[in-house]
Interface confidence: low
């Protein structure tokens, strides 16, 4: 069965720094989403080989990509306190397969010592049910994403 290997499990970084999240699979994908989990999960990026990546307005200009959709490294730059959260890779095959998640803790520089990542990965039970639609806009669209609906026709 298809699996998504995601790293790191957790990282603590100061405001303004960057973080790399790597999503690796055995191939056979249509594309890959990076989703920020929470009460209202958000699609951050959609990446597909040979296509201009689509990025949520909140992260536009702050995300770089390297590799391919089968082994993708997503670099998030100029992190803000509000970027703290768990990010999970969602590989699109015939079924939606999730990575284990990356907990990103963005801290004020002087308070880094108060926040530590444990060795345990984020709990898989925190992952949402696979969505049947995505709210990502076209790459050139400047509007912010609405909350992802249960199902939608993409633009």
């Amino acid at each position: 069965a298809q699996e998504v290997q995601q790293s790191p499990h957790c990282t603590t970084v100061p405001v303004g720094a960057s973080v790399n999240i790597t999503c690796s699979t055995s191939g056979g994908l249509r594309g890959i989403y990076l989703r920020q989990l929470g009460p209202q999960p958000q699609d951050i990026i959609y990446y597909e080989d040979g296509v201009v990546p689509t990025t949520d307005r909140r992260f536009r200009g702050r995300i770089d990509f390297s590799g391919s959709q089968d082994n993708l490294t997503i670099t998030m730059h100029r992190l803000q306190l509000s970027d703290t959260g768990t990010y999970t890779c969602q590989a699109i095959t015939e079924v939606n397969v999730y990575g284990s998640g990356t907990l990103v803790l963005v801290t004020e520089e002087q308070s880094q010592g108060w926040h530590r990542c444990s060795d345990a990965p984020p709990r898989a039970s925190a992952l949402p049910a696979p969505p049947t639609g995505s709210a990502l806009p076209d790459p050139q669209t400047a509007s912010a994403l609405p909350d992802p609906p249960a199902a939608s026709a993409l633009p």
Epitope: R30, Y46, E48, G50, V51, G133, D138, L154
Partner: nanobody
């Protein structure tokens, strides 16, 4: 208005070949991921093959690997499915579909393929 119109189905013998076409209007096939699905009587719709939006990768169901080939002609705005070495279990209604991201947004009505033994 988006329309996907399949053609090329028919009745063939085991081991024969067919080429299905899917003519698109209202969308540009080179800007969409395009795929083929099939549904046999009394069964759920089944993925057959797709070609990525960028055109650089294709996916096939295990049951058709090595026998079916998906392709598209951007100038004709048409998707194709070349089906070789057909088997009775390939009998189904074949539909093409288009997706902008991961979810399939647009569907054709389908064309019947019947493989007799």
């Amino acid at each position: 208005q988006v329309q996907l119109q399949e053609s090329g189905g028919g009745l063939v013998q085991t081991g024969d070949s067919l080429r299905l076409s899917c003519a698109a209007s209202g969308l540009t096939v080179s800007s969409y991921g395009m795929g083929w699905f099939r549904q046999a009587p009394g069964k759920e719709r089944e993925f057959v093959a797709d070609i990525s939006r960028g055109g650089g990768s294709t996916l096939y169901a295990d049951s058709v690997k090595g026998r079916f080939t998906i392709s598209r002609d951007n100038l004709k705005n048409t998707l194709y499915l070349q089906m070789n070495s057909l088997k009775p279990e390939d009998t189904a209604v074949y539909s093409c579909a288009a997706r902008k991201y991961a979810e399939w947004n647009y569907w054709g009505q389908g064309t019947q393929v019947t493989v007799s033994s």
